[in-house]
């Protein structure tokens, strides 16, 4: 039964997205009071784990040496005290990538484009997925999130950029996954320079690197625009 | 642009505390951990610790436990340090630096650094 | 704690010379978090390869990184004037974070 205890804190370090193999550490912080910490994944029997606090009693981490399939899903934490346990912690959702092979990611009709015009990434897998996702390097969130209707395969994924800005310049990566768990990705795609030359208009500015999509609004690089794909996947913002 | 600007130099005296900010713009704060680095002069680098500002989570190096606390208003984008009971060997060059939260590719490397702030513990 | 240790920790190469330091792990660590940076007399660190052989943004196609477990490298194919700085490898593989010591390259 849940008390009127504050929640917990529960966070991954040294964050979400996990590659397979790699280790990785969830914390749950609570209170000085705390006794017994425990940890619930969703869809799994309940407590997934269950942990003795660190000192100071405000803490404890739940460690997966190498990450597999197994690990990756949704996960909350509690904390019991001496007046019972707490409201669970908001969820973390622990991604791991590494699950299929690598799409191959492309442009069309060139990775070199000039200010003002178009250009499609495509994303290209060898077995038929029914989610894309597109990254711009080193950015913190998936700038689109390509997923087909009905649960449709897909071997393909289209991301147009229009009009090109010198705000789209930079490296990009793609995955491939299966909406039964989009907690589970392909390894990333090879990455793919697109390179933006000025106009006239628009001179190009000297390279600076590569900033997360959500710097604000003259800094989002992907504006989704025209009509749906023809790949008939739906489009979606992470 | 992203950038990570540092408050100004600290002279303090041994015993006392002080609080270095880094306020952090160009991109969602509560997406990326704020690690923080010490640099001794003529040294090489040592982490002291990180916040992800977007619950408060921290983990420390544990040289660091009782030495660093780290804390941040997400209103301001701002990140903190205090450093405690200081004395000459905590004289050194402080960064903050940003590491994403989400990396899809996995490295969870230290993309963006401040320009640093110089502590100086002197009587 | 991992120790890493970098070799040599002054080196001194002519222009268009081709150019490698090593970082030595003292236990496995995993090609994903392991990083090298560059930095400049009175500037920040600035990433410069990540996950081993991974370019950061900006970084002249000269560079490249390499290695697995305990034994990596960073190549620079032709030495240029503003390569002139220490570098130092970085691993996330455990906490706490740890730094090598630096390998500082001048020109000779």
């Known amino acids: 039964q849940a008390g009127p205890l504050p929640k917990p804190t529960l966070w991954a370090e040294p964050g979400s997205v996990i590659s397979w193999g790699n280790s990785v550490t969830i914390w749950c912080q609570g209170t000085l009071e705390a006794r017994e910490y425990r940890l619930d994944k969703e869809e799994s029997p309940a407590p997934w784990d269950r942990q003795n606090p660190l000192e100071p009693k405000n803490k404890a981490r739940f460690s997966i040496p190498s990450m597999t399939e197994d690990y990756a899903g949704r996960y909350r934490c509690y904390y019991r005290s001496p007046v019972g346990w707490s409201q669970p912690s908001d969820p973390l959702e622990l991604v791991m990538t590494g699950a299929y092979s690598k799409p191959t990611l492309s442009a069309l009709p060139s990775p070199l484009v000039t200010s003002g015009k178009s250009v499609t990434l495509l994303c290209q897998s060898r077995s038929p997925m029914d989610t894309f996702l597109l990254i711009k390097e080193r950015a913190a969130h998936p700038l689109l999130h390509l997923r087909s209707e009905h649960g449709a395969q897909q071997h393909q994924a289209e991301f147009p950029m229009s009009p090109v800005t010198s705000v789209h310049g930079g490296t990009y990566r793609c995955f491939s996954s299966h909406g039964f768990s989009h907690y589970l990705l392909s390894h990333p795609s090879d990455p793919l320079e697109l390179i933006v030359s000025g106009s006239l208009e628009d001179p190009r500015p000297s390279p600076t690197r590569s900033v997360s999509t959500a710097a604000g609004p003259e800094d989002q690089p992907l504006m989704p625009t025209g009509s749906v794909p023809h790949s008939g996947l739906r489009r979606h913002w992470e | 642009e992203v950038q990570l600007q540092q408050s100004g130099p600290e002279l303090v005296k041994p015993g006392a505390s002080v609080k270095i900010s880094c306020k952090a713009s160009?991109?969602?704060?509560?997406?990326?951990?704020m690690d923080w680095v010490k640099q001794s002069h003529g040294k090489s680098l040592e982490w002291i610790g990180y916040?992800?500002?977007?619950?408060?989570?921290?983990g420390y190096n544990q040289k660091f436990n009782s030495k660093a606390t780290l804390t941040v208003d997400k209103s301001s984008s701002t990140a903190y340090m205090e450093l405690h009971s200081l004395t000459s060997e905590d004289s050194a060059v402080y960064y903050c630096?940003?590491?994403?939260?989400?990396?899809?590719?996995?490295?969870?490397?230290?993309?963006?650094w401040g320009q640093g702030t110089s502590v100086t513990v002197s009587s | 704690q991992i120790v890493l240790t970098q070799s040599p920790a002054i080196m001194s190469a002519s222009l268009g010379e081709r150019v490698t330091m090593t970082c030595t792990a003292s236990?496995?660590?995993?090609?994903?978090?392991l990083h090298w940076y560059q930095q400049k007399p009175g500037s920040s660190p600035k990433l410069w390869i990540y996950?081993?052989?991974n370019l950061a943004s900006g970084v002249p196609a000269r560079f490249s990184g390499s290695g697995s477990g305990t034994s990596y490298s960073l190549t620079i194919s032709s030495m240029e004037a503003e390569d002139a700085a220490t570098y130092y490898c970085?691993?996330?593989?455990?906490?706490?974070?740890?730094f090598g010591g630096g390998t500082k390259l001048e020109i000779k």
């Open positions: 996950s081993t052989s």
């Open positions: 970085h691993q996330y593989h455990r906490s706490p974070r740890t």
């Open positions: 630096a940003s590491s994403p939260y989400y990396d899809y590719v996995g490295s969870y490397a230290m993309d963006y």
């Open positions: 236990s496995s660590v995993s090609s994903s978090y």
């Open positions: 160009g991109y969602t704060f509560t997406d990326y951990n």
């Open positions: 916040i992800y500002p977007n619950n408060g989570g921290t």
